[in-house]
Protein backbone atom coordinates (compact mmCIF):
# COMPACT_ATOMS: atom_id res chain seq x y z
CA UNK A 1 0.00 0.00 0.00
CA UNK A 2 1.62 3.33 -1.05
CA UNK A 3 2.07 5.84 1.80
CA UNK A 4 -0.18 8.89 2.12
CA UNK A 5 2.06 10.63 4.67
CA UNK A 6 5.79 10.56 5.33
CA UNK A 7 8.15 10.86 8.28
CA UNK A 8 9.78 14.09 9.37
CA UNK A 9 12.49 15.19 6.89
CA UNK A 10 10.77 13.26 4.08
CA UNK A 11 8.40 14.21 1.27
CA UNK A 12 5.86 12.25 -0.75
CA UNK A 13 6.40 11.92 -4.50
CA UNK A 14 5.36 9.25 -7.00
CA UNK A 15 3.66 7.33 -4.17
CA UNK A 16 6.86 7.01 -2.18
CA UNK A 17 8.57 8.83 0.65
CA UNK A 18 11.86 10.48 -0.28
CA UNK A 19 14.37 12.07 2.10
CA UNK A 20 14.57 15.85 2.02
CA UNK A 21 17.97 17.40 1.31
CA UNK A 22 19.84 18.63 4.36
CA UNK A 23 20.57 22.34 4.87
CA UNK A 24 23.35 23.46 2.53
CA UNK A 25 22.25 21.10 -0.25
CA UNK A 26 19.72 21.27 -3.10
CA UNK A 27 17.63 18.56 -4.76
CA UNK A 28 18.92 17.08 -8.02
CA UNK A 29 16.95 13.84 -8.29
CA UNK A 30 14.05 12.43 -6.30
CA UNK A 31 14.63 9.03 -4.73
CA UNK A 32 13.74 5.96 -6.77
CA UNK A 33 12.88 2.37 -5.87
CA UNK A 34 16.64 1.75 -5.77
CA UNK A 35 18.36 4.89 -4.57
CA UNK A 36 18.06 7.69 -2.04
CA UNK A 37 17.31 11.31 -2.97
CA UNK A 38 20.28 12.90 -4.74
CA UNK A 39 21.31 16.24 -3.27
CA UNK A 40 24.15 18.55 -4.30
CA UNK A 41 26.01 21.11 -2.15
CA UNK A 42 25.15 24.76 -2.72
CA UNK A 43 27.95 26.74 -4.39
CA UNK A 44 30.07 29.22 -2.42
CA UNK A 45 27.77 32.18 -3.02
CA UNK A 46 24.56 30.28 -2.19
CA UNK A 47 22.72 28.76 0.76
CA UNK A 48 19.71 26.75 1.90
CA UNK A 49 18.92 26.97 5.60
CA UNK A 50 16.28 24.23 5.99
CA UNK A 51 15.69 20.57 5.14
CA UNK A 52 14.33 21.03 1.65
CA UNK A 53 13.45 19.83 -1.84
CA UNK A 54 14.53 23.04 -3.57
CA UNK A 55 16.14 22.59 -6.97
CA UNK A 56 17.99 25.90 -6.63
CA UNK A 57 19.95 27.32 -3.71
CA UNK A 58 19.30 30.95 -2.68
CA UNK A 59 21.90 33.60 -3.43
CA UNK A 60 23.63 35.10 -0.41
CA UNK A 61 22.50 38.63 0.37
CA UNK A 62 24.81 41.31 -1.08
CA UNK A 63 25.82 44.02 1.39
CA UNK A 64 25.96 46.98 -1.01
CA UNK A 65 28.46 49.60 0.20
CA UNK A 66 26.67 52.17 -1.97
CA UNK A 67 23.68 51.72 0.33
CA UNK A 68 25.87 52.07 3.43
CA UNK A 69 25.98 48.33 4.10
CA UNK A 70 28.85 46.09 5.18
CA UNK A 71 29.10 42.37 6.03
CA UNK A 72 28.50 41.59 9.68
CA UNK A 73 28.58 37.81 9.23
CA UNK A 74 29.68 36.00 6.08
CA UNK A 75 27.13 33.51 4.72
CA UNK A 76 27.77 29.76 4.62
CA UNK A 77 26.09 27.02 2.57
CA UNK A 78 23.51 26.84 5.39
CA UNK A 79 23.14 30.50 6.37
CA UNK A 80 22.55 33.80 4.61
CA UNK A 81 25.01 36.69 4.86
CA UNK A 82 24.07 39.17 7.60
CA UNK A 83 24.51 42.83 6.66
CA UNK A 84 24.87 45.74 9.00
CA UNK A 85 25.35 49.47 8.46
CA UNK A 86 28.54 51.46 8.37
CA UNK A 87 29.43 53.68 11.34
CA UNK A 88 26.93 56.52 11.77
CA UNK A 89 24.19 54.68 9.86
CA UNK A 90 21.41 52.23 10.78
CA UNK A 91 19.09 49.88 8.92
CA UNK A 92 15.98 51.36 7.35
CA UNK A 93 13.98 48.16 7.90
CA UNK A 94 14.25 44.80 9.62
CA UNK A 95 15.54 43.21 6.42
CA UNK A 96 18.33 45.84 6.38
CA UNK A 97 18.34 46.44 2.64
CA UNK A 98 19.67 49.99 3.00
CA UNK A 99 20.94 52.39 5.63
CA UNK A 100 20.16 55.93 6.74
CA UNK A 101 22.17 58.29 8.96
CA UNK A 102 21.45 58.22 12.68
CA UNK A 103 19.20 61.10 13.68
CA UNK A 104 20.52 63.73 16.08
CA UNK A 105 18.61 64.88 19.15
CA UNK A 106 17.79 68.60 18.83
CA UNK A 107 18.50 71.16 21.56
CA UNK A 108 16.13 70.47 24.46
CA UNK A 109 16.42 66.74 23.84
CA UNK A 110 19.11 64.28 24.89
CA UNK A 111 20.11 60.81 23.75
CA UNK A 112 18.24 58.11 25.66
CA UNK A 113 19.74 55.26 23.60
CA UNK A 114 22.67 55.56 21.24
CA UNK A 115 21.98 54.20 17.74
CA UNK A 116 23.39 50.85 16.59
CA UNK A 117 23.78 49.38 13.13
CA UNK A 118 20.20 48.20 13.31
CA UNK A 119 18.41 50.82 15.45
CA UNK A 120 18.11 54.61 15.32
CA UNK A 121 18.96 57.07 18.05
CA UNK A 122 16.24 57.34 20.71
CA UNK A 123 15.81 60.89 22.05
CA UNK A 124 14.06 62.07 25.21
CA UNK A 125 13.06 65.58 26.29
CA UNK A 126 15.35 67.02 28.93
CA UNK A 127 13.46 67.02 32.25
CA UNK A 128 13.51 69.93 34.67
CA UNK A 129 17.04 70.30 36.01
CA UNK A 130 18.63 69.13 32.78
CA UNK A 131 19.43 70.69 29.41
CA UNK A 132 20.94 70.09 26.01
CA UNK A 133 22.09 73.01 23.91
CA UNK A 134 23.44 70.98 20.96
CA UNK A 135 22.10 68.85 18.12
CA UNK A 136 23.83 65.51 18.76
CA UNK A 137 23.51 61.76 18.20
CA UNK A 138 25.57 61.03 21.32
CA UNK A 139 25.00 63.65 24.02
CA UNK A 140 22.64 63.00 26.91
CA UNK A 141 20.80 65.77 28.76
CA UNK A 142 23.25 67.41 31.15
CA UNK A 143 22.30 68.61 34.64
CA UNK A 144 22.13 72.32 35.30
CA UNK A 145 25.14 73.69 37.05
CA UNK A 146 24.74 73.79 40.83
CA UNK A 147 25.54 77.44 41.71
CA UNK A 148 25.41 76.73 45.44
CA UNK A 149 28.31 74.32 45.39
CA UNK A 150 30.41 77.07 43.84
CA UNK A 151 29.23 79.54 46.48
CA UNK A 152 27.41 81.41 43.73
CA UNK A 153 23.79 82.30 43.15
CA UNK A 154 21.53 81.72 40.17
CA UNK A 155 21.44 84.85 38.08
CA UNK A 156 19.52 83.35 35.20
CA UNK A 157 17.30 80.31 35.41
CA UNK A 158 18.08 77.32 33.23
CA UNK A 159 15.77 75.86 30.58
CA UNK A 160 15.71 72.53 28.75
CA UNK A 161 18.05 74.18 26.20
CA UNK A 162 20.25 76.34 28.42
CA UNK A 163 22.22 75.99 31.60
CA UNK A 164 21.65 78.26 34.56
CA UNK A 165 23.83 81.34 34.79
CA UNK A 166 25.58 81.70 38.14
CA UNK A 167 26.86 84.95 39.62
CA UNK A 168 28.41 86.27 42.82
CA UNK A 169 26.18 86.77 45.84
CA UNK A 170 25.24 90.42 46.57
CA UNK A 171 27.21 91.44 49.71
CA UNK A 172 25.34 93.90 51.98
CA UNK A 173 27.51 96.66 53.21
Amino acid sequence: EPPTACREKQYLINSQCCSLCQPGQKLVSDCTEFTETECLPCSESEFLDTWNRETRCHQHKYCDPNLGLRVQQKGTSETDTICTCEEGLHCMSESCESCVPHRSCLPGFGVKQIATGVSDTICEPCPVGFFSNVSSAFEKCRPWTSCETKDLVVQQAGTNKTDVVCGPQDRQR
Epitope: V28, S29, F34
Partner: antibody
Protein backbone atom coordinates in the same frame (compact mmCIF):
# COMPACT_ATOMS: atom_id res chain seq x y z
CA UNK B 1 10.35 0.11 -23.98
CA UNK B 2 13.52 0.32 -21.89
CA UNK B 3 16.70 -0.65 -23.69
CA UNK B 4 20.29 -0.74 -22.43
CA UNK B 5 22.94 -1.65 -24.98
CA UNK B 6 26.59 -2.13 -24.01
CA UNK B 7 29.57 -1.93 -26.37
CA UNK B 8 33.34 -1.54 -26.25
CA UNK B 9 34.37 -4.91 -24.83
CA UNK B 10 37.11 -7.02 -26.39
CA UNK B 11 40.43 -8.76 -25.91
CA UNK B 12 43.06 -6.69 -24.11
CA UNK B 13 46.52 -7.43 -22.71
CA UNK B 14 47.24 -7.20 -18.96
CA UNK B 15 47.88 -3.56 -18.02
CA UNK B 16 45.79 -2.39 -20.96
CA UNK B 17 42.70 -0.16 -21.07
CA UNK B 18 39.21 -0.10 -22.56
CA UNK B 19 36.24 2.26 -22.54
CA UNK B 20 32.86 0.56 -22.29
CA UNK B 21 29.69 2.39 -23.34
CA UNK B 22 26.02 1.82 -22.64
CA UNK B 23 23.32 3.50 -24.75
CA UNK B 24 20.07 3.93 -22.81
CA UNK B 25 16.57 4.58 -24.14
CA UNK B 26 12.94 4.26 -23.08
CA UNK B 27 13.22 6.00 -19.69
CA UNK B 28 14.27 9.34 -18.19
CA UNK B 29 17.97 8.49 -17.99
CA UNK B 30 19.06 11.50 -15.86
CA UNK B 31 16.62 10.56 -13.07
CA UNK B 32 18.33 7.25 -12.32
CA UNK B 33 21.60 6.19 -10.79
CA UNK B 34 23.34 3.73 -13.10
CA UNK B 35 25.72 0.88 -12.32
CA UNK B 36 28.11 -1.53 -13.95
CA UNK B 37 28.00 -5.14 -12.73
CA UNK B 38 30.34 -7.86 -13.96
CA UNK B 39 30.22 -11.64 -14.01
CA UNK B 40 33.22 -13.89 -14.54
CA UNK B 41 32.46 -17.19 -16.33
CA UNK B 42 30.57 -19.45 -13.91
CA UNK B 43 30.89 -16.91 -11.10
CA UNK B 44 28.61 -14.74 -8.97
CA UNK B 45 27.65 -11.20 -9.96
CA UNK B 46 29.95 -8.41 -8.76
CA UNK B 47 28.99 -4.73 -8.56
CA UNK B 48 31.88 -2.57 -9.82
CA UNK B 49 30.64 1.03 -10.06
CA UNK B 50 27.69 3.38 -9.62
CA UNK B 51 27.11 6.96 -10.74
CA UNK B 52 24.31 9.17 -9.42
CA UNK B 53 21.66 10.64 -11.72
CA UNK B 54 23.49 13.95 -12.08
CA UNK B 55 26.90 12.31 -12.46
CA UNK B 56 28.22 14.18 -9.41
CA UNK B 57 28.61 11.17 -7.11
CA UNK B 58 30.49 7.99 -8.03
CA UNK B 59 31.05 4.86 -5.96
CA UNK B 60 33.38 1.87 -6.37
CA UNK B 61 34.43 -1.22 -4.42
CA UNK B 62 38.08 -1.30 -3.30
CA UNK B 63 38.92 -3.94 -5.93
CA UNK B 64 38.58 -1.42 -8.77
CA UNK B 65 39.09 1.99 -7.09
CA UNK B 66 41.73 3.97 -8.97
CA UNK B 67 41.54 1.69 -12.02
CA UNK B 68 37.91 2.06 -13.11
CA UNK B 69 36.08 5.33 -13.79
CA UNK B 70 32.32 5.53 -14.28
CA UNK B 71 30.77 8.56 -15.96
CA UNK B 72 27.64 9.56 -17.84
CA UNK B 73 26.48 11.91 -20.56
CA UNK B 74 22.88 12.79 -19.74
CA UNK B 75 22.47 14.82 -22.92
CA UNK B 76 23.12 11.69 -24.96
CA UNK B 77 21.69 9.08 -22.57
CA UNK B 78 25.00 7.24 -22.37
CA UNK B 79 26.83 5.55 -19.52
CA UNK B 80 30.58 4.87 -19.63
CA UNK B 81 33.12 2.75 -17.79
CA UNK B 82 36.80 3.38 -18.39
CA UNK B 83 38.83 0.39 -17.27
CA UNK B 84 42.63 0.57 -17.00
CA UNK B 85 45.56 -1.37 -15.50
CA UNK B 86 43.57 -4.47 -16.42
CA UNK B 87 44.33 -7.81 -14.77
CA UNK B 88 43.36 -11.34 -15.74
CA UNK B 89 40.80 -11.35 -12.90
CA UNK B 90 38.95 -8.48 -14.61
CA UNK B 91 37.93 -10.90 -17.37
CA UNK B 92 34.13 -10.94 -17.25
CA UNK B 93 30.86 -10.03 -18.91
CA UNK B 94 30.17 -6.38 -18.03
CA UNK B 95 26.52 -5.39 -17.63
CA UNK B 96 25.09 -1.88 -17.59
CA UNK B 97 22.11 -1.63 -15.24
CA UNK B 98 19.61 0.75 -13.71
CA UNK B 99 18.88 -2.15 -11.30
CA UNK B 100 15.36 -2.33 -12.76
CA UNK B 101 16.73 -3.06 -16.23
CA UNK B 102 19.91 -4.72 -17.51
CA UNK B 103 21.68 -4.76 -20.83
CA UNK B 104 22.86 -7.96 -22.53
CA UNK B 105 26.47 -7.30 -21.51
CA UNK B 106 29.79 -6.78 -23.26
CA UNK B 107 32.63 -9.26 -22.79
CA UNK B 108 36.05 -8.08 -21.61
CA UNK B 109 38.85 -10.63 -21.89
CA UNK B 110 42.25 -9.84 -20.35
CA UNK B 111 44.91 -12.19 -21.67
CA UNK B 112 48.53 -12.06 -22.80
CA UNK C 1 32.02 -5.05 3.31
CA UNK C 2 28.58 -6.58 3.83
CA UNK C 3 28.56 -10.28 3.00
CA UNK C 4 25.31 -11.68 1.60
CA UNK C 5 24.93 -15.38 2.33
CA UNK C 6 22.29 -17.35 0.43
CA UNK C 7 20.91 -20.74 1.32
CA UNK C 8 20.67 -23.26 -0.08
CA UNK C 9 24.19 -22.34 -1.17
CA UNK C 10 24.35 -24.08 -4.53
CA UNK C 11 21.17 -25.63 -5.82
CA UNK C 12 17.55 -26.10 -4.87
CA UNK C 13 15.94 -29.07 -6.59
CA UNK C 14 12.14 -28.70 -6.87
CA UNK C 15 9.25 -30.32 -8.68
CA UNK C 16 7.13 -28.15 -10.95
CA UNK C 17 4.12 -26.85 -9.02
CA UNK C 18 5.93 -27.05 -5.67
CA UNK C 19 6.79 -24.12 -3.41
CA UNK C 20 10.42 -23.00 -3.28
CA UNK C 21 12.06 -20.83 -0.65
CA UNK C 22 15.48 -19.15 -0.77
CA UNK C 23 17.00 -17.43 2.23
CA UNK C 24 19.46 -14.53 2.23
CA UNK C 25 21.31 -13.23 5.30
CA UNK C 26 23.39 -10.05 5.45
CA UNK C 27 26.45 -9.85 7.74
CA UNK C 28 25.09 -6.57 9.17
CA UNK C 29 21.84 -4.63 9.05
CA UNK C 30 21.00 -3.12 5.67
CA UNK C 31 18.25 -0.89 7.05
CA UNK C 32 19.04 2.81 6.55
CA UNK C 33 18.29 5.41 9.24
CA UNK C 34 15.26 6.59 7.23
CA UNK C 35 13.81 3.07 7.30
CA UNK C 36 14.62 2.10 3.71
CA UNK C 37 16.08 -1.34 3.01
CA UNK C 38 17.51 -1.78 -0.48
CA UNK C 39 17.29 -5.57 -0.74
CA UNK C 40 16.60 -6.95 -4.20
CA UNK C 41 16.14 -10.38 -5.77
CA UNK C 42 17.20 -11.19 -9.32
CA UNK C 43 16.73 -14.21 -11.55
CA UNK C 44 19.35 -15.06 -14.17
CA UNK C 45 18.13 -17.61 -16.66
CA UNK C 46 20.79 -19.60 -18.55
CA UNK C 47 22.54 -17.44 -21.17
CA UNK C 48 20.61 -14.31 -20.19
CA UNK C 49 21.26 -11.16 -18.18
CA UNK C 50 19.71 -10.89 -14.69
CA UNK C 51 16.08 -9.77 -14.34
CA UNK C 52 14.70 -7.90 -11.34
CA UNK C 53 11.99 -9.72 -9.39
CA UNK C 54 11.71 -7.93 -6.02
CA UNK C 55 12.96 -4.56 -4.77
CA UNK C 56 12.97 -3.02 -1.29
CA UNK C 57 12.51 -6.44 0.33
CA UNK C 58 8.92 -7.13 -0.69
CA UNK C 59 7.88 -5.06 -3.71
CA UNK C 60 7.25 -7.06 -6.88
CA UNK C 61 8.67 -5.39 -10.00
CA UNK C 62 6.24 -4.69 -12.84
CA UNK C 63 5.40 -7.77 -14.88
CA UNK C 64 6.63 -10.20 -12.19
CA UNK C 65 4.01 -12.91 -11.47
CA UNK C 66 2.38 -12.83 -8.03
CA UNK C 67 3.68 -16.31 -7.25
CA UNK C 68 6.94 -14.51 -6.33
CA UNK C 69 7.02 -12.85 -2.91
CA UNK C 70 9.73 -11.31 -0.75
CA UNK C 71 9.85 -10.83 3.00
CA UNK C 72 12.21 -10.16 5.88
CA UNK C 73 13.87 -7.32 7.76
CA UNK C 74 17.16 -6.26 9.29
CA UNK C 75 19.53 -9.03 8.22
CA UNK C 76 17.23 -11.93 7.26
CA UNK C 77 15.33 -12.08 3.99
CA UNK C 78 13.41 -14.69 2.05
CA UNK C 79 12.21 -15.17 -1.52
CA UNK C 80 9.26 -17.56 -1.97
CA UNK C 81 7.90 -19.00 -5.22
CA UNK C 82 4.48 -20.44 -4.48
CA UNK C 83 4.11 -22.76 -7.50
CA UNK C 84 7.30 -23.29 -9.50
CA UNK C 85 6.96 -23.16 -13.28
CA UNK C 86 9.50 -24.17 -15.93
CA UNK C 87 10.28 -20.53 -16.75
CA UNK C 88 11.38 -19.96 -13.12
CA UNK C 89 14.46 -22.14 -13.51
CA UNK C 90 17.81 -20.37 -13.27
CA UNK C 91 20.07 -18.77 -10.67
CA UNK C 92 18.54 -16.48 -8.02
CA UNK C 93 20.66 -13.75 -6.47
CA UNK C 94 19.93 -11.47 -3.52
CA UNK C 95 21.57 -8.04 -3.58
CA UNK C 96 22.01 -5.26 -1.05
CA UNK C 97 22.15 -1.69 -2.38
CA UNK C 98 22.01 0.02 1.02
CA UNK C 99 25.71 0.32 1.80
CA UNK C 100 28.69 0.78 -0.54
CA UNK C 101 30.21 -1.48 -1.68
CA UNK C 102 26.96 -3.06 -2.87
CA UNK C 103 27.09 -6.84 -2.75
CA UNK C 104 25.37 -9.90 -4.24
CA UNK C 105 24.74 -13.24 -2.65
CA UNK C 106 26.50 -16.26 -4.11
CA UNK C 107 23.43 -17.41 -6.01
CA UNK C 108 21.03 -20.36 -5.67
CA UNK C 109 20.29 -22.50 -8.70
CA UNK C 110 16.66 -23.57 -8.94
CA UNK C 111 16.49 -26.85 -10.86
CA UNK C 112 14.06 -29.66 -11.55
CA UNK C 113 14.20 -32.61 -9.18
Amino acid sequence: QVKLEESGGGLVKPGGSLKLSCAASGFTFRNYAMSWVRQSPGERLEWVAEVSGSGYYTYYPDTVTGRFTISRDNANNTLYLEVSSLRSEDTAMYYCTSRAYWGQGTLVTVSA
Amino acid sequence: DIVMTQSPTLSLPVSLGDQASISCRSSQSIVLTNGNTYLEWYLQRPGQSPKLLIYKVSNRFSGVPDRFSGSGSGTDFTLKISRVEAEDLGVYYCFQGSHVPYTFGGGTKLEIK
